[in-house]
Interface confidence: low
Amino acid sequence: ACDTATCVTHRLAGLLSRSGGVVKNNFVPTNVGSKAF
């Protein structure tokens, strides 16, 4: 399962779809990320 800050935030915000954790708005942090990054 996705365990990064981004995923946690999106899970809490109800943004994760039910189809395997893909973010509905296709957002990924960049850090490095980086969300990052």
């Epitope: 996705c2 365990d3 990064t4 800050a5 981004t6 995923c7 946690v8 935030t9 395997g20 954790g21 893909v22 973010v23 708005n25 296709n26 957002f27 990924v28 942090p29 960049t30 850090n31 490095v32 990320g33 980086s34 969300k35 990052a36 990054f37």
Partner: antibody
């Protein structure tokens, strides 16, 4: 104008310490997740540490290679990020970049500093 | 940790040609992949996030695709300023990781 400016790099002996700073301006620093990413001379990028935004309790995460030696912190009142580096090793020699990210719903913002060089050598 | 493998290591092309860069993850990362461009002496620059979203101000000739473990960065028609090193990264699991980079050089 948005800026991230790193400072504090330099030459240090193995086993020594350094404190890197990253000064932010031109955006709401406290909303941003910030990471340190490093790049050894002639090598690729390596994530070092992350600190979440103020609203995410400024939680931290570290790469295994630096866990227990490096500490990331932030001072939102000063719009500043820090990386305290202890027990430095030759393999920590790199340019260290700070990079900030913010998701405002429809898109994201991502900023990088120019980097500061850390050289660990006797 | 999730290992990202980029190929080819070096890509030699001419301006106007199409460039296709690959990034393969050792485990499924859904769409938590970003692409960066880096020129000598400069910080990385975000091109693509979420596998396929162009970052602000990035020209339309840059596009990203893929999900799961296989990802691609495509530059439809190379401009002289596109010759640089390109890195993919994942932020699906800690630690965040980067690929080793693909150097895009002028043929």
């Amino acid at each position: 104008e948005v800026q991230l400016v790193e400072s504090g790099g330099g030459l240090v002996q193995p086993g020594g310490s350094l404190r890197l700073s990253c000064a932010a301006s031109g955006f709401t620093f406290s909303n941003y997740w910030i990471s340190w990413v490093r790049q050894a001379p002639g090598k690729g990028l390596e994530w070092v540490a992350e600190i979440r935004s103020e609203s995410d309790a400024s939680a931290t995460h570290y790469a295994e290679a630096v866990k227990g030696r490096f500490t990331i912190s932030r001072d939102n009142a000063k719009n500043s990020l820090y990386l305290q580096m202890n027990s430095l090793r030759a393999e920590d020699t790199a340019v260290y970049y700070c990079t900030g990210y913010f998701d405002y719903g429809l898109a994201i913002q991502n900023y990088w500093g120019q980097g500061t060089l850390v050289t660990v050598s006797s | 940790e999730i290992v990202l493998t980029q190929s080819p290591a070096t890509l030699s092309l001419s301006p106007g040609e199409r460039a296709t860069l690959s990034c393969k993850a050792s485990k499924r990362v859904t769409t938590y992949v970003s692409w960066y461009q880096q020129k000598p002496g400069q910080a990385p620059r975000l091109l693509i996030y979420g596998a396929s979203n162009r970052y602000l101000g990035i020209p339309a000739r840059f596009s990203g695709s893929g999900s799961g473990t296989d990802f691609t960065l495509t530059i439809s028609s190379l401009e002289p300023e596109d010759f640089a090193v390109y890195y993919c990264s994942q932020s699906y699991n800690y630690p965040y990781t980067f690929g080793q980079g693909t150097k895009l050089e002028i043929k």
